[in-house]
């Protein structure tokens, strides 16, 4: 169930897809990873407060113990709730080869 | 991909499976379920630090480039990978029924 | 930013020769690294090239003659046994896939005896 | 061993002419544009003018332009400059790392 989509705390501070520019340094990849020379990373990033959307019942227990016991529960957090592909190029021992990745950029967020 | 199990942290700090107590008042449920009367909740707490249980690709992404802009990009977040499934008896408008949920209890945790 | 290469000499065949690149205003570290070379009045031949960690992959001409090694401030190129026909031109320069964009001016390596 | 032909040399161009080089290869480069263009000049190092087959390095003038993918690609160089005199040689990364290489080279002549 994906529950509200409208922030208590303000436009864009809860949870949704933001565009970080990175280099294959940055990422770690310069070594292994030909192209692109540089990724447009899609992640899920902002707060998630009460029933914001809710990715399913265990989220909906957590908002609730968090409300409860905040030191010991954390709040849900915002992760991918689905993926985009991505080919990258990349070195083998002998050359080169495209793979495709299913699980590297976040196309939708929720909170869990 | 299922990366490092030891945790730098010490024991038990970093992203696990944990069991929190809670009675159906705490969960806001005591006016639909009638059982169980309290339930043992199992939740993922914990800190993520680099590369523990990195559930994908996306999150060694996300570990490097919190590395890099630690205000502008999260850790990763200890969340479910897979659920338990529990059984509620639950009040109906006629009756009581008995409803299986997939995805209230966690299983198993990783860092995403 | 730019890159040069040791001084090339006059060797005997079978001598080991080890060339030398030193970079100057950018990190080894973080780019791929070429070896080229070129005979007298002949066109280029790519030796081989390096990665930001230093693993090496050559060409197949190449066929174990060369060594490409790599520290945090040089890349070296080894001619591992010389013979007259590796009398050229040796350039190192920066890059692999999006083309070698800084090279230094070259270092003739004579090999006769 | 992979095949890199160039335009044979040499090639005559006149001072604001247009000159074309081509350069085919008898596989395809990776991604299909995995293909650069150098400038040599006697007694100096190639220079870099195009890689990813089209795209223009830093500082090198418009007039020149390349095209081409996957194993057809051409270097043409418009209002052709008495500077431009020098030997022009394509290179390509193929999936195979014991295929890269150069084309044999181009020289051209300005008159």
């Known amino acids: 169930a994906r529950n509200g989509d409208h922030c208590p705390l303000g436009p864009g501070r809860c949870c949704r897809l933001h565009t970080v520019r990175a280099s294959l340094e940055d990422l770690g990849w310069a070594d292994w990873v030909l192209s692109p020379r540089e990724v447009q990373v899609t992640m899920c990033i902002g707060a998630c407060p009460s029933q914001f959307r809710a990715a399913n019942m265990h989220a909906q227990i957590k908002t609730s113990l968090h409300r409860l016991k905040p030191d010991t529960v954390p709040a849900p957090c915002c992760v991918p709730a689905s993926y985009n592909p991505m080919v990258l190029i990349q070195k083998t021992d002998t050359g080169v080869s495209l793979q495709t990745y299913d699980d590297l950029l976040a196309k939708d967020c929720h909170c869990i | 991909a299922r990366n490092g199990d030891h945790c730098p942290l010490g024991p038990g700090r970093c992203c696990r499976l944990h069991t929190v107590r809670a009675s159906l008042e705490d969960l806001g449920w005591a006016d639909w379920v009638l059982s169980p009367r309290e339930v043992q909740v199992t939740m993922c707490i914990g800190a993520c630090p680099s590369q523990f249980r990195a559930a994908n690709m996306h999150a060694q992404i996300k570990t490097s480039l919190h590395r890099l802009k630690p205000d502008t990009v999260p850790a990763p977040c200890c969340v479910p990978a897979s659920y338990n499934p529990m059984v509620l008896i639950q009040k109906t408008d006629t009756g009581v029924s008995l409803q299986t949920y997939d995805d209230l209890l966690a299983k198993d945790c990783h860092c995403i | 930013q730019s890159v040069k290469e040791s001084e090339g000499r006059l060797v005997t065949p079978g001598t080991p020769l080890t060339l030398t690149c030193t970079a100057s205003?950018?990190?080894?570290?973080?780019?791929?690294m070429s070896w080229v070379r070129q005979a007298p009045g002949k066109g280029l031949e790519w030796i081989g090239f390096v990665s930001p960690s230093g693993r090496a992959y050559y060409t197949s001409w190449v066929n174990g003659r060369f060594t490409i090694s790599k520290t945090s401030t040089t890349v070296d190129l080894k001619i591992t046994s010389p013979t007259t026909e590796d009398t050229a031109t040796y350039f190192c320069?920066?890059?692999?896939?999006?083309?070698?964009?800084?090279w230094g001016p070259g270092t003739l390596v004579t090999v006769s005896s | 061993a992979i095949d890199m032909t160039q335009t044979p040399s040499p090639v005559s161009a006149t001072v604001g002419g247009t000159v074309t080089i081509s350069c085919q290869s008898s596989?395809?480069?990776?991604?299909?544009?995995?293909l650069a263009w150098y400038q040599q000049k006697p007694g100096q190092p190639p220079k870099l003018l195009i890689y990813?087959?089209?795209t223009l390095a830093s500082g090198v003038p418009s007039r020149f332009k390349g095209s081409g993918s996957g194993t057809q690609f051409t270097l043409t160089i418009s209002d052709v400059q008495c500077a431009d005199a020098a030997t022009y040689y394509c290179a390509g990364v193929y999936n195979n790392d014991s295929d890269n290489g150069f084309g044999g080279g181009t020289e051209v002549v300005v008159k």
């Open positions: 990813d087959a089209a």
């Open positions: 596989k395809s480069v990776v991604n299909g544009d995995w």
């Open positions: 320069a920066r890059g692999y896939t999006s083309g070698l964009d800084i």
């Open positions: 205003g950018f990190s080894l570290s973080s780019h791929w």
